[in-house]
Amino acid sequence: MADGSSDAAREPRPAPAPIRRRSSNYRAYATEPHAKKKSKISASRKLQLKTLLLQIAKQELEREAEERRGEKGRALSTRCQPLELAGLGFAELQDLCRQLHARVDKVDEERYDIEAKVTKNITEIADLTQKIFDLRGKFKRPTLRRVRISADAMMQALLGARAKESLDLRAHLKQVKKEDTEKENREVGDWRKNIDALSGMEGRKKKFES
């Protein structure tokens, strides 16, 4: 078996792997350096992709910030008149300052009133929401916080105890339901796990996934 594999390595195109029925086959297959199952994406490529994604995200954030600035500018330009100071004397400029101060005071008062109304509305909404929950006999909605969580932990949190017995997400994702192959290799188990274990990938994989 090993000979066949090494022959294939000397040819320009690698031959397909032999049908694997015994665990010894897998061991030999795994220990052959030329036939070692490589990760589809190298670590440097992963890093490159991560960096690219971060760059794109950064650009998006900058674009959004720029859009917000532009929106603010547009809003201000519709609300604030340009200062037309040309030809105005010192007297008019002083008067204008008084006018603008008065306008600022007025806007401040309006802002204070609006904030008070908003606060009142928020309180009313909270009270009404609470009443709705009370009427439905439901618990009070907790305040949500943003948390870092893995997919497994999320499933655990969502499904509780059932998650352990019913759902191993990654196992589900990796399972290939081909009846013939399953019958043939029933005694073998998951050959990928064997390869990972033998090549020392298991530990690294766990680290990466966590």
């Epitope: 008149q81 340009p82 037309e84 100071l85 040309a86 030809g87 105005l88 004397g89 010192f90 007297a91 008019e92 002083q94 008067d95 204008l96 006018q99």
Partner: antibody, heavy 119, light 113 residues
């Protein structure tokens, strides 16, 4: 040559209305603040109103506030003074005046005036 | 409001004489930030509209003969005509441009003897 020409004056009854115009030429009208100044029969000069170059800022003395409205049409190079609720003390020669350059002061140019008689 | 008081109300002078007229304001017209006094002098000849002679109390407007000299600071100002000419026969008004409402003095009438 800077030229300011007032029109629209005349005889009006107390409580009446009148609209004065001032046609400007010889300078970039939209770059200067403009004012109306009146001169009573006793030769006393009274400032009536001022408007900024773009028309956003307006200034009046208390004596005319709420009764007179200054405005401008920069496309037509024209300054206006709408006078409502006229009183006998509003009788005067009404001049339109251009303010000096920003780094200077005072009314640099005056029109020939238009006479308003409230009687 | 700033009150502007001019004196004398009229004066008669002969050609070639030196003329001095006064203008007092009820409060200072000096802007401490730029050290400028916001006072202007106007000349109004009979049947004509006013003409700017001096601004910032002492700066002569372009085209105004150098015999017209503005001076003073704060609340006391003076317009001097060093050598009166026949064409100087007119009313002279001072005006403060320091604060609104803008106010004028009652004027000084210059007559020739």
């Amino acid at each position: 040559e800077v030229k300011l020409e007032e029109s629209g004056g005349g005889l009006v009854k107390p409580g009446g209305t009148l609209k004065l115009s001032c046609a400007a030429s010889g300078f970039t009208f939209s770059s200067y603040a403009m004012s109306w100044v009146r001169q009573t029969p006793e030769k006393r000069l009274d400032w009536v109103a001022t408007i900024s170059s773009g028309g956003s800022y307006i200034f009046y003395p208390d004596s005319v506030k709420g009764r007179f409205t200054i405005s401008r049409d920069n496309a037509r190079n024209t300054l206006y003074l709408q006078m409502n609720s006229l009183r006998s003390e509003d009788t005067a020669m009404y001049y339109c005046a251009r303010h000096h350059n920003p780094d200077k002061s005072g009314f640099a140019y005056w029109g020939q005036g238009t006479l308003v008689t409230v009687s | 409001d700033i009150v502007m008081t001019q004196s004398p109300s009229s004066l008669a002078m002969s050609v070639g004489q030196k003329v001095t007229m006064s203008c007092k304001s009820s409060q200072s017209l000096l802007n401490s930030s730029n050290q400028k006094n916001y006072l202007a002098w106007y000349q109004q000849k009979p049947g004509q509209s006013p003409k700017l002679l001096v601004y910032f109390a002492s700066t002569r407007e372009s085209g105004v003969p150098d015999r017209f000299i503005g001076s003073g600071s704060g609340t006391d100002f003076t317009l001097t005509i060093s050598s009166v000419q026949a064409e100087d026969l007119a009313d002279y008004f001072c005006q403060q441009h320091y604060s609104t409402p803008l106010t004028f003095g009652a004027g000084t009438k210059l007559e020739l003897k």
